[in-house]
């Protein structure tokens, strides 16, 4: 309910004045009242609302000796660093008994040079690629008209005639500066100058030219780079381990990439020292004097299989009567692919070489026919992948088995498709 109707005369003898100024201005509003008896607290209103955190001071001067005599009360409201939020209608308010009294209003207004709410920002753009810049300013006084400048040259005949809040640039071929001027009745304010750096466009069509087990040759098409020639391109390769999850356009891979630089032209590079039969992801970026382009998406590639780099290890060949036992271990050297099996060759001193495909077993029992009198019988073994045979082992002579020597326990495998081998010259 109201604190009563205002039947009595207002106690205010001085009302707040008006303040109009530019942002940052400091000013004081003042009101004065004369009351009988105990002086009330003076409240300040802005647009009808009590200002709880007002920077105000109240001075009270008695006009007589007695407490019930009249008092002069002066309240001053200080506005420091004037902002748009400070503008409005200001009044003093007092509660006297059951009545509410408000002073006549004073006004606080903002008027000055335009104030930027948003200014163009520095940025990098790819050559010949459209982009937008933003600029926003306000008064009062309104209206505020904007004029964009590129390299200090106005982009319109007059403020307000060209683009306003947003400037659309269809593309640049050289690094340029942009600013905007804000014009109102009080004058002109110029924004910061934004530097737009023109970088090369992202390369296109990254592809494989040739593949070898430990190297890949790749090529790409460079993007436009404006007036700045490309100085070099950088290629990155990273192992795509199972579950690594590099997708097209995914951010940086989880491990340190292998980085190579290519002089340009040609836009081609041989990447060496790779692992054979291994999936990689590669990407490329090209650089001019202004900086690097964005990376291409990661391209999945794979090195082909190679042949094993070494022969099988620890080959032993022993003979016991009509059987020869040969066994070996997987090569210690890199296989460069998926091991598909072993080939075995044997040869007597004066006999032609015989080749056998053993498959993935690491042992074989040869069924010898005759008395085994062939002299200097030697055995060689090689591992092979889909890419071909690895190097053959050195010839291992077939040794006679001596009683007391551990007899290797080998199962003689006689598969229907693989008949027991015989010595055709015996």
């Amino acid at each position: 309910a109201p604190r009563g109707t205002q039947a009595e005369e207002s106690p205010f003898v001085g009302n707040p004045g008006n303040i109009t100024g530019a942002r940052g201005l400091t000013g004081t509003l003042r009101c004065q009242l004369q009351v009988q008896g105990e002086p009330p607290e003076v409240h300040w209103l802005r647009d009808g609302q009590i200002l709880e955190l007002a920077d105000s001071t109240q001075t009270q001067v008695p006009l007589g000796e007695d407490e019930q005599d009249d008092w002069i009360v002066v309240s001053q409201l200080r506005i420091t660093s004037l902002q748009l939020s400070d503008t409005g209608q200001y009044q003093c308010l007092v509660f006297l008994g059951h009545q509410t009294f408000v002073s006549q209003p004073g006004y606080v207004g903002l008027e000055g040079l335009p104030y930027f709410l948003e200014e163009p920002e520095d940025r990098t753009v790819a050559a010949n690629t459209p982009f937008n810049l933003s600029c926003q300013a306000q008064g009062p006084p309104e209206p505020v008209d904007l004029l964009w400048l590129q390299d200090a040259v106005p982009l319109a005949t007059a403020p307000g005639h060209g683009p306003q809040r947003s400037l659309h640039v269809p593309g640049l071929n050289k690094t340029s500066s942009f600013s905007c001027e804000a014009h109102n009745a009080k004058g002109v304010t110029t924004s910061r100058t934004a530097t737009i750096t023109v970088l090369p466009q992202q390369p296109r069509n990254l592809h494989l030219v040739s593949r070898q087990p430990t190297e890949l040759e790749v090529a790409w098409t460079p993007g436009l780079s404006g007036i700045y020639p490309l100085t070099h391109c950088t290629l990155q390769a990273v192992l795509s381990d199972d579950g690594m999850g590099i997708q097209a356009g995914e951010p940086d891979p989880p491990e340190e990439p292998l980085t190579s630089q290519a002089s340009v032209p040609p836009h081609q590079l041989r990447l060496g020292s790779l692992h054979p039969h291994t999936p990689y992801h590669i990407r490329v970026a090209c650089t001019s004097s202004q900086g690097p382009s964005s990376w291409t998406h990661w391209l999945p590639v794979e090195t082909p299989e190679g042949v094993p780099l070494g022969p099988p290890e620890n080959i032993s060949a022993t003979r016991n009567g009509s059987q020869a036992f040969v066994h070996w271990q997987e090569p210690r050297a890199p296989l460069q692919g998926t091991l598909l099996g072993y080939r075995l060759a044997y040869q007597g001193q004066d006999t032609p070489e015989v080749l056998m495909d053993i498959g993935l077993r690491q042992e074989v029992t040869l069924e010898l026919q005759g008395d085994g009198s062939v002299s200097n019988l030697t055995v060689c073994v090689a591992a092979y992948t889909a890419a071909g045979d690895g190097p053959w082992s050195l010839p291992v002579p077939l040794e006679a088995w001596r009683p007391g020597q551990a007899q290797p326990v080998h199962q003689l495998v006689k598969e229907p498709s693989t008949p027991a081998f015989s010595w055709p010259w015996w």
């Epitope: 109201p2 109707t5 205002q6 009808g48 009590i50 209608q89 308010l93 408000v102 006549q104 209003p105």
Partner: antibody, heavy 122, light 107 residues
Amino acid sequence: QVQLQQSGPELVKPGASVKISCKASGYSFTSYYIHWVQQRPGQGLEWIGWIYPGSDNTKYNEKFKDKATLTADTSSGTAYMQLSSLTSDDSAVFYCARNYYDYDGGTWFPYWGQGTLVTVSA
Amino acid sequence: DIQMTQTTSSLSASLGDRVTISCRASQDINYYLNWYQQKPDGTVKLLIYYTSRLHSRVPSRFSGSGSGTDYSLTISNLEQEDIATYFCQQGNTLPWTFGGGTKLEIK
């Protein structure tokens, strides 16, 4: 006691203007703010703006700046709102309300008019 | 502008029930939250101001609480005359804004 008495319903044609009134009594008209509020059919309330009759100063919600004009006549203790370029979208009940000064600050409306229905129809 | 949201647009309750209506502001409104009652005939009355202060001649079964952005109005013992639509309003920052309203009906 404080009372706000609003004018009766209005039926107006699209494109026309209408002026509705709010007569205040029971308090010092020039010491308080009169606010105006719109309520479209079946909708919530929207603040339009205020006028301070003691100075004729006004403040508008940006949304209603070009639609409403607030005035006051201190001799009769009446506040007015003129609505211009009316469309069927402007059909609504319009309320006037009075503010209240309190130590705590804030703005609320303890006194409301009964509302004026404005119907815009060809 | 500060958005005021009353998520429940209508509510059914029985006479004697305790009913709570909520209101959320899109930013902190410093307790400057007021509740109004609009009767079916369009009459609007202030119930609560400054979050929890009861306006004069408002029955004590109405109460308000909240802080920051979340506020509520509670009717402790619903009576027939409380059938109305209830609106919240923020009085912190211009423009003053209202919630969409919660219509209270009797089951």
